[in-house]
Interface confidence: low
């Protein structure tokens, strides 16, 4: 047995006479032989579920579910109840109604075996019948909604009449009907005004019925019509077996470059027209078992169950269903030497499914694990500026397909052929298994005899000791120019373009910092800032070279505080900033502030200045100071 609603509403008035019928509660059967028996909880509850008092006023007919006033609720009783309501005005009280047989102890009130009956309390006597509006004569203030279990015997689940109105205003005639599409499984009996199902419902055919209840009021010569929604939801049971969409029960996969633990190797989808078990229970009751194979297979793979609700069309309406993705996942990193082919089977069991037929499916995965060879190009050639600063990134080395690798460990090393010209270093990028080449020794860069640097690049997978080698030729270009005095170690300190571009900083490949002009769109990823190289900093990611020294790119790497409009990076740096962002790495602080100069005249002036510097001065920069700008403004 179950209630057709989890909550009911009615109005209560002071001194309403004993014997007044209030409302019916309805139970529907799970099996044809069941007979409902109703009982009320012992207590009345108030605001925020305060237990107010033993219920001495309202009774229920155990067989019919009719609630009625056993004795009038007088003003003093009401004041007594109000005093227990935690200081809140007592506007609503509720009772619990249980379906027997249930435990006799009154505790949780949960559908389907318990419903709450709410009474809106009016600290006045019942109003004159003539003063009641048609809406008040027809329907409760709160619109009901109904829940009916699929595949259960049909039965009565609602009674339209407002019983106190019928009892106290017998001269007002109220008629009801349901507006329903052809062939809907509901009927409203014209005499008793009971609404019932005609036959058992099937949720997989239709889950929601949005009916409309029509009430016609006759009071003397007056006739008025009131319409309200009358929604019915069909509740699911596990009556559908799992199936394969389009009959696909086998997936084939190749494991090659993606060998990392937790990599999804292949996915098979199972469809179930049901949406039960509910999400909390689903994984426990919808089981998947990787059938025993050899030890290696059991250790290497696992199956993950990812259920998702979906919608499918049935008879012109959409109903919910479930798709279950079963993912074959690597349980550990695979060595690059691993080379084998296998067939795996997964048993899926919808343990709640009662039949007919079986709730069991067998999923098949055919997996080939291929070995990976390490190859480098025969040689690399690149150039570096003699002005480059320490930690400047000048290039990358990468074994064949390294961008596609995951779970494959490759370490890069540089072996220099000239002992005193070991200028470069290499670090392995965790993201794409490439090696980032960077300037490690700027003194060596400046030696005339180090104009050409020869290295051997060695890539090693330590797990298997497999290696690959390549020649690297680095040409050192340009003249060394000493930096201006007073330049900061970090490009990020500079807050304005002129001071940014006249200094270098750690990580700068050209020996000069670069200005990145932002888009000026509020808090943006593209904020204005000074960087050693806009190719790598800031890019929202603190790379393996930048982690060597916080002065290289605090915009990506700082873990300290950021002042001003910004969105912090995860787990560090500035993801987005307002205006211009500059940083003081030693103090572990960054500041994001509005651009200093934003009026059109200034923009025009900056354009003029740029033209002067590039054309008239043949590239020799004449920088205009802030004082010059202010002077231009005032004159």
């Amino acid at each position: 047995l179950y209630f057709s609603r989890d909550a009911y509403w009615e109005k209560l008035y002071v001194d309403q006479p004993a014997g007044t019928p209030l409302l019916y509660v309805h139970a529907l059967r799970d099996a044809p032989e069941e007979v409902p028996s109703f009982r009320l909880g012992q207590h009345l509850y108030g605001t925020y579920r305060t237990r107010l008092h033993e219920n001495n006023w309202i009774c229920i007919q155990e067989d019919t579910g009719l609630l009625y006033l056993n004795r009038s609720l007088d003003r003093s009783s009401w004041e007594k109840l109000s005093g227990r309501n935690r200081g809140f005005p007592l506007l609503t009280v509720y009772l619990k109604v249980f379906l027997s047989p249930t435990s006799l102890r009154e505790g949780e009130c949960q559908w389907p075996g318990c419903a709450r009956v709410y009474f809106s309390f009016f600290n006045t006597s019942f109003p004159a019948c003539t003063s009641l509006k048609p809406r008040e004569l027809c329907f409760p203030e709160t619109r009901p909604s109904f829940r009916i279990r699929e595949n259960r015997p049909p039965g009565t689940f609602h009674q339209f009449r407002l019983l106190p109105v019928q009892f106290l205003c017998p001269n007002i005639s109220v008629a009801y009907r349901l507006l329903e599409g052809e062939g809907l499984p509901f009927r409203c009996a014209p005499d008793s005004l009971e609404v019932s199902t005609r036959w058992a419902l099937d949720r997989e055919q239709r889950e929601k019925y949005e009916l409309v209840a029509v009430c016609t009021v006759h009071a003397g010569a007056r006739e008025e019509v009131v319409m309200v929604p009358f929604p019915v939801t069909v509740y699911d049971e596990d009556d559908s077996a799992p199936t394969f969409p389009a009959g696909v029960d086998t997936a084939s996969a190749v494991v090659e470059f993606k060998r990392k633990e937790d990599t999804v190797v292949a996915t098979l989808r199972v469809f179930d027209a049901d949406v039960v078990p509910a999400s909390g229970e689903l994984v426990r009751r919808y089981t998947s078992t990787l059938l025993p194979g050899d030890t290696w297979t059991q250790q290497t793979f696992r199956v993950e169950h990812w259920p998702n609700e979906t919608s499918v069309q049935a008879n012109g309406s959409f109903v919910r269903a479930t798709v279950h993705d079963y993912r074959l996942v690597l349980n550990r990193n695979l060595s690059i030497s691993e080379n084998r082919t296998m067939q795996l089977a997964v048993l899926v069991n919808d343990s709640d499914f009662q039949g007919p037929g079986a709730g069991v499916l067998l999923l098949h995965f055919n997996v080939s694990v291929l070995p990976v060879s390490l190859h480098l190009p025969s040689s690399y050639s690149l150039s570096v500026s003699r002005r480059a600063r320490r930690f400047a990134q000048i290039g990358k080395v990468c074994v064949e397909n390294c961008q596609a690798f995951s779970g494959i460990n490759v370490q890069y090393e540089l072996h220099s052929s000239g002992a005193n010209c070991s200028t470069l270093g290499v670090v392995t990028s965790a993201e794409d298994t490439s090696g980032i080449l960077f300037v490690n020794d700027t003194k060596a860069l400046r030696r005339p005899k180090c104009a050409e640097l020869h290295y051997m690049v060695v890539a090693t997978n330590h797990q298997t000791s497999r290696q690959a080698q390549a020649q690297l030729l680095v040409t050192v270009e340009g003249l060394y120019v000493a930096e201006e005095a007073g330049c900061p170690l970090s490009c990020a300190v500079s807050k304005r373009r002129p001071e940014c571009e006249e200094c270098g900083g750690l990580g700068s490949p050209t020996g000069r910092c670069e200005w990145r002009q932002g888009d000026g769109k509020g808090i943006t990823r593209n904020f204005s800032t000074c960087s050693p190289s806009t190719k790598t900093c800031p890019d929202g990611h603190c790379d393996v070279v930048e982690t060597q020294d916080i002065n290289i790119c605090p915009q990506d790497c700082l873990r300290g505080s950021i002042v001003g409009g910004h969105e912090p990076g995860e787990p560090r740096g500035i993801k987005a900033g307002y205006g211009t962002c500059n940083c003081f790495p030693e103090e572990e602080k960054c500041f994001c502030e509005p651009e200093d100069i934003q009026d059109p005249l200034c923009d025009e002036l900056c354009r003029e200045q740029k033209l002067i510097s590039e054309e008239d001065l043949g590239g020799e920069q004449k920088l205009i100071s802030e004082e010059d700008l202010h002077h231009h403004h005032h004159h």
Epitope: Y48, R86, G87, E108, C109, Q110
Partner: antibody, heavy 118, light 107 residues
Framework: EVQLVESGGGLVQPGGSLRLSCAAS????????MSWVRQAPGKGLEWVSG????????FYVDSMKGRFTISRDNSKNTLYLQMNSLRVEDTAVYFC???????????WGQGTLVTVSS | DIQLTQSPSFLSASVGDRVTITCWAS??????LAWYQQKPGKAPKVLIY???TLQSGVPSRISGSGSGTEFTLTISSLQPEDFAAYYC?????????FGQGTKLEIK
């Protein structure tokens, strides 16, 4: 099986902010009032804030009104506590708890530690 | 706000002893009181609610009584697993408040 799992705790400086989350499962989340209760190291339990099932009514202990905000996302079955202007004395383990019909807390999370220190 | 005062703050007892913890409310809270047990590093666990109703799964040697402003928690025969901290909590109105706690130790 009812489960409440808190997250979002950590170390924060005085004046800073944190947002705690509590993921609920195994019961009809919308039906129940939920609360946050905290416990300073070596001290007793202190109720912090409560929220009704729909999220329309919220309740706070006076000393935290204005600084702390309780909220819930019933579509995600998640309870939140936004804590601003944190003080050293807010250092505690913060538990989320499900209120029973009678008002007592019948299920608790495992707690998340919030440390406010300079 | 409603204040709750627990007594005693510390209690030493032996296995098999009968112990009583008292909780006083600063105003009438009817039967709106709960008792919790807490072990180190764990979340509290409800023992009694509505002053005297035993939470399901809690052993019957634990009982609660009282109404209005004075409440007691009684453990009729202490077991090793009962040594823990105990708190009362009023549920009569927001803000909910807890007693300062009673630490029950092995003598």
């Amino acid at each position: 099986e009812v489960q409440l799992v808190e997250s979002g705790g950590g170390l924060v400086q005085p004046g800073g902010s944190l947002r705690l989350s509590c993921a609920a499962s195994g019961f009809t989340f919308t039906t129940y009032f939920m609360s946050w209760v905290r416990q300073a190291p070596g001290k007793g339990l202190e109720w912090v804030s409560g929220i009704s099932g729909s999220g329309t009514s919220t309740f706070y202990v006076d000393s935290m009104k204005g600084r702390f905000t309780i909220s819930r996302d019933n579509s995600k079955n998640t309870l939140y506590l936004q804590m601003n202007s944190l003080r050293v004395e807010d250092t505690a383990v913060y538990f989320c708890a499900k209120e029973n019909t009678y008002g007592h807390f019948d299920f608790w999370g495992q707690g998340t530690l919030v440390t406010v220190s300079s | 706000d409603i204040q709750l005062t627990q007594s005693p703050s510390f209690l030493s007892a032996s296995v098999g002893d009968r112990v009583t913890i008292t909780c006083w409310a600063s105003q009438d809270i009817s039967s709106h009181l709960a008792w919790y047990q807490q072990k180190p590093g764990k979340a509290p666990k409800v023992l009694i609610y509505d002053a005297s109703t035993l939470q399901s799964g809690v052993p019957s040697r634990i009982s609660g009584s009282g109404s209005g402003t004075e409440f007691t928690l009684t453990i009729s025969s202490l077991q090793p697993e009962d040594f823990a901290a105990y708190y009362c909590q009023q549920l009569d109105g927001y803000p909910y408040t807890f007693g300062q706690g009673t630490k029950l130790e092995i003598k």
